[in-house]
């Protein structure tokens, strides 16, 4: 059986302050069952950016319907970007459990924020 891949196609994305940023992520398989979460940064200090199951993320929306059967696109859109949003974003697949277990991370997408054109 082919190993699950978490694909973040863009190494970097540059966005003007105030605009929206789209961070792309797809998975190569629906198996194993489990959620996708987005983080900024890596390691124990990473910041949770988006989790479908719980939490309130007012500036983050899913590009595709994350509840749809057979959905393999877990891209997100972050609105009203500010310089504080700069960093490397990771799309991470978890295996469903109690608790969920981290399975595989994408390679990361570095978001850089340009000054708003005057």
């Amino acid at each position: 059986e082919e190993e699950l891949q978490v694909i973040q196609p863009e190494k970097s994305v540059s966005v003007a302050a105030g605009d929206s940023a789209t961070l792309n992520c797809t998975v190569s398989s629906l198996i194993p069952v489990g959620p996708i979460q987005w983080f900024r940064g890596a390691g124990p200090g990473r910041e949770l950016i988006y989790n479908l199951k719980e939490g309130h993320f007012p500036r983050v929306t899913a590009v595709s319907d994350p509840t749809k059967r057979n959905n393999m696109d877990f891209s997100i859109r972050i609105s009203n970007i500010t310089p504080a949003d700069a960093g490397t974003y990771y799309c991470v697949k978890f295996r469903k459990g109690s608790p969920d277990v981290e399975l595989k991370s994408g390679a990361g997408t570095e978001l850089s924020v340009r000054a708003k054109p005057s």
Epitope: I31, D65, T67, K68, R69, N70
Partner: antibody
Framework: AVTLDESGGGLQTPGGALSLVCKGS????????MNWVRQAPGKGLEWVAG????????YYGAAVQGRATISRDNGQSTVRLQLNNLRAEDTATYYC?????????????????WGHGTEVIVSS | ALTQPASVSANPGETVEITCSGG?????YGWFQQKSPGSAPLTVI????KRPSDIPSRFSGSKSDSTGTLTITRVQAEDEAVYYC??????????FGAGTTLTVLG
């Protein structure tokens, strides 16, 4: 108990428009995807349209694509189906359905509750 | 559309299986009972094998490969109905089978 109450059916004229409303109660409406399913006289079940729990994503069956709009108001616990340019083939009983905590619009395997249905007759 | 047998029959107390195939890869199946035309369908199984709280345990569902199966053990006269399976195709569109008429003999 979960209840889904449809309204808005009745006699419609060809080329006209109809608006069906389904009111849900007995469950957390905003947590569940919803679908509309219809059944023409003497025929089987046909999926019409569906909508995700937050209303951001909508899905339509081939027979109504371009003529239908599904929307929801989670504050009022209602889902609405608007169908334009009505044809005789739209004559059917229309059922509102609720997904049971899985899937989204179109994911019929997740339907766990049905309304009583509202009859629509398209005739001149 | 999904593929299911047009009809099945069983004697009271027997076990009957109704199959359904043709859903999208990795998709699940639901099963809906309609006792008479024009009456509202009732979900007996959803998400492959989950049973709504008001449905007797005689009804069960399973999925193997891409085929879903509804199993009714100890069939009773009141189970006589048309059973529809439902799923989504690979494009995400909802699809039903044409329905299977269950006749309880005797």
């Amino acid at each position: 108990a979960v209840t889904l109450d449809e309204s808005g059916g009745g006699l419609q004229t060809p080329g006209g428009a109809l608006s069906l409303v389904c009111k849900g109660s007995g469950f957390t409406f905003s947590s569940h995807a919803m679908n509309w399913v219809r059944q023409a006289p003497g025929k089987g079940l046909e999926w019409v349209a569906g909508i995700s729990s937050d209303g951001r994503f909508t899905y339509y069956g081939a027979a109504v694509q371009g003529r239908a709009t599904i929307s929801r108001d989670n504050g009022q616990s209602t889902v609405r189906l608007q169908l334009n340019n009505l044809r005789a083939e739209d004559t059917a009983t229309y059922y509102c359905t609720k997904n049971g905590g899985c899937g989204s619009g179109g994911d019929l395997d997740c339907i766990d509750a049905w309304g009583h249905g509202t009859e629509v007759i398209v005739s001149s | 559309a999904l593929t299911q047998p047009a009809s099945v029959s069983a004697n009271p107390g027997e076990t009957v299986e109704i199959t359904c195939s043709g859903g999208g890869s990795n998709n699940a199946y639901g099963w809906f009972q309609q006792k008479s035309p024009g009456s509202a369908p009732l979900t007996v199984i959803y998400d492959n094998g989950k049973r709504p709280s008001d449905i007797p345990s005689r009804f069960s569902g399973s999925k193997s490969d891409s085929t879903g199966t509804l199993t009714i053990t100890r069939v009773q006269a009141e189970d006589e109905a048309v059973y529809y399976c439902g799923s989504a195709d690979n494009s995400g569109a909802g699809v039903f089978g044409a329905g299977t008429t269950l006749t309880v003999l005797g």
